[in-house]
């Protein structure tokens, strides 16, 4: 709200723009008849320095010249790069209560002369684009700096454009707005950038180029693919390009891949045949273009075409396994299981599986289709049966996989020996074995099969299995292996028409069980006590139970209890003990032991044997 510079003037020597490190003299002069009323001698001029609108210094001590009451000159040094504001004020010393009155102010800019622009680079995007050049301006000047881009070429062609840099905008690129046409392909052009500000000027070295050097073709557009006869592996990629393009680069990859397939195509004219695609796979395709075989620049990659290749009939064979159980006096239930094909084998969406169960001698055949990966049928217990399964998609079916239905554990001579199961880490178990000792027929393959030792549905919880070649004697099982769960593991040795198996239990991690078995009854029979119990609930077992312990001691005794250790068998829920004295009251309880330790004790029961117990 002040009338700026009504009271006086402020001038700068040598100029309001100075190089870094220079000093300046600032003079503040009052206009005639201005100043403190009636007392000119009491006029005191002060100079205040502001940076970013913040008062940083009173330059009272920097006076180098003083005409009392009329003007003062101050020397300022060590000014930082950028702009600094100086304000001259009048202080009437006889009136202490009045604040100093602004007289006038000046801005001093400190900067550097521009460096010669470097690294000039020019491009024309597409045949119909315009020439644009960019450069490196060098160090910041802190001053308004004008840049002029000049182009000269054949036939007295000249053209120039200007822009400036200051503290709000940067000028390091200019579009000349002119188009270079292919008929000037061999001509040479020269560009130069000149920079100028209040402290000096500089010019770049001339930069020479040809049409081919700077024209970057537009990326190809309208990309599409046509699959020959709906093939999943062969397709023709088509696109639109600028007229002068002679070279294309194609890249394509399945969407989940990390490396591109690269192809160079000369004179493709917007068309290229691909022959190595994977059926029923999501692909991404991109194309780039170049105007000259040896010179020039590649265009940017085109926008991606994303598409899925068509299906082809499945290949590979299904991994089949089965379970067989007698369900009455002359019938058996066969449950067939198989693993889904991996995507490279399925080569499409599997719509259904074709299942065949055939009795070899009578030529009885049961056939069905299912969308599930299991199939169950009841068949006679007599006869030799074989099963086959194939997978079908919209283009066809895989070759059927055959398996002979044999009694999987029927031949003792084929049972593998020395089966062991060791926990490797939290989620796998290493199973090892030795081959059958006296097999009367050659082992064709081993199957390692495992199931959790907890209640499950036969069809909802199918088995897990691994096929192992006959010369291997170990398997690392990890599919569906969870810690603190006990698994029953079977190693099957299969010949052409027979099977033998051995079983073991194993876990990947174990803890001591949460509780001990619950004693349900104690009965006396033929001078022996029978202890009956219910097993620990499966979630509380926390691994494979190795054995149970039955403890007993005389009631109110402080002696250590006696104990009897029983090998754990799920089918067993009672055990005799025979070392208790008749007509003595005992307290009994049970615990369970895993490889990690013993559970807390289960419930306590008191019992007083009546007869002679020996």
């Amino acid at each position: 709200n002040i009338d700026v510079c009504k009271l006086g003037t402020v001038t700068v020597q040598p100029a309001p723009v100075i190089p870094l490190g220079s000093a300046a003299n600032i003079s503040c002069s009052l206009n005639p008849k201005q100043g403190c009323s009636h007392y000119p001698s009491s006029n005191e001029l002060i100079l205040l320095k502001f940076v970013n609108d913040v008062l940083v210094e009173n330059l009272h001590g920097k006076k180098v010249h003083d005409h009392t009451g009329h003007s003062s000159t101050f020397q300022v040094t060590n000014l930082s790069l950028g702009m600094t504001l100086f304000v001259c004020k009048l202080n009437c010393s006889n009136s202490q209560k009045k604040p100093p009155v602004p007289v006038c102010g000046v801005e001093i800019s400190v900067g550097v002369a521009p460096e010669p622009p470097q690294n000039i680079s020019c491009v024309q995007e597409g045949e119909n684009g315009t020439v644009a050049c960019s450069w490196n301006s060098g160090k910041v000047t802190y001053l308004k700096t004008n840049y002029t881009l000049q182009l000269s070429g054949p036939n007295n062609l000249t053209c120039q454009k200007q822009c400036f840099s200051d503290n709000r905008q940067n000028c390091n690129r200019l579009d000349l707005g002119i188009n270079l046409s292919p008929d000037l392909a061999e001509s040479r052009f020269i560009v130069r950038v000149t920079a100028i500000n209040d402290l000096g000027n500089s010019s770049s070295l001339p930069h020479t180029f040809t049409f081919l050097d700077i024209v970057i073709p537009l990326p190809p557009w309208d990309i599409r693919i046509n699959f020959l006869n709906a093939s999943g592996s062969r397709g023709t990629l088509q696109w639109e390009d600028e007229g002068q393009v002679v070279l294309n680069q194609l890249r394509y990859q399945p969407l989940n891949s990390t490396s591109w397939n690269m192809v160079n195509a000369t004179n493709a004219k917007g068309k290229y045949d691909l022959r190595d695609l994977r059926p029923f796979t999501e692909y991404e395709f991109q194309i780039s273009s170049k105007l000259h075989l040896s010179g020039g620049s590649w265009s940017n990659w085109s926008e991606s075409l994303r598409t899925r290749t068509p299906e082809e009939e499945p290949v590979g064979i299904l991994d089949i396994w089965y379970m067989k159980q007698d369900i009455d006096y002359d019938r058996q239930q066969i449950s067939l299981f198989w693993k889904s094909l991996n995507p490279s084998e399925a080569r499409g969406k599997i719509l259904h599986y074709q299942v065949t169960l055939q009795e070899v001698t009578k030529k009885t055949t049961l056939q069905n289709t299912t969308r599930h990966t299991s199939w169950t049928r009841v068949i006679p217990r007599t006869g030799a049966w074989t099963a086959s399964v194939s997978a079908a998609n919209s283009k066809g079916a895989s070759a059927p996989t055959h398996i002979n239905i044999v009694d999987l554990c029927g031949t003792g001579l084929l049972a593998p020996h020395q089966v062991s199961a060791k926990s490797e880490n939290m989620d796998n178990i290493l199973v090892t074995w030795q081959p059958p000792k006296k097999a009367d027929s050659a082992v064709r393959e081993y199957i390692v099969e495992w199931r959790a030792l907890q209640p499950g549905s036969i069809t909802k919880f199918p088995p897990h299995w691994l096929r192992i070649p006959p010369d291997n004697m170990s398997a690392l099982i990890s599919e569906n292996i969870k810690p603190y769960i006990c698994y029953e593991i079977r190693v099957h040795a299969l010949s052409e028409s027979q099977g033998g198996c051995s079983s073991i239990r194993g876990d990947s991690k174990h803890k001591a069980p949460v509780s001990g078995p619950h004693i349900t009854a104690i009965t006396e029979k033929k001078e022996r006590l029978f202890i009956s119990w219910t097993h620990i609930p499966f979630p509380e077992q926390r691994g494979c139970i190795l054995h149970y312990r039955i403890y007993w001691k005389e009631r109110d005794s402080t002696a250590q209890p006696e104990l009897c250790e029983i090998q754990y068998r799920r089918s067993q829920n009672s055990h005799p003990i025979s070392s208790l004295q008749p007509r003595v009251t005992y307290v009994l309880w049970m615990t369970a032991v895993t490889a990690a330790g013993e559970s807390p004790q289960g419930n306590e029961r008191e019992f007083c044997p009546q007869g002679k117990a020996n």
């Epitope: 599930h372 199931r451 907890q454 209640p455 549905s457 036969i458 069809t459 909802k460 079983s503 799920r570």
Partner: nanobody, 119 residues
């Protein structure tokens, strides 16, 4: 443990129909494969039909096309609809559930319901 309770048996004339029901209770969380068996006087118990967790069904040849097994998971029940009944269908019909633990199959049985086909 699993408990099974059958109902719906009775006396019916040849060509008639009956619908047997079986309701499961107890530890049924792992029971998905349900069966019907029958035992005629002086004969061994024989398989009649079963239904799996995925509603796949299978039948004894002599009842195929006349009997239909179905289930209602919400009611923990399995049913046997018996049509065109014949005198040779006379038997005690048992509901059965099979559960697998490791490689051991546990069988659970109902107490049976009598079906008599006679004129």
């Amino acid at each position: 443990q699993v408990q099974l309770q059958e109902s719906g048996g009775g006396l019916v004339q040849p060509g008639g129909s009956l619908r047997l029901s079986c309701t499961a209770s107890g530890s049924i969380f792992a029971i998905d494969d349900m069966y019907w068996y029958r035992q005629a006087p002086g004969k061994q118990r024989e398989f009649v039909a079963y239904i799996t967790a995925t509603n796949s069904a299978n039948y004894l040849d002599s009842v195929n096309g006349r009997f239909t097994i179905s289930r209602d998971n919400a009611k923990n029940s399995v049913y046997l609809q018996m049509n065109s009944l014949k005198p040779e269908d006379t038997a005690v019909y048992y509901c059965n559930a099979k559960q697998i633990v490791g490689f051991q199959i546990d069988d659970y049985w109902g107490q049976g319901t009598q079906v008599t086909v006679s004129s």
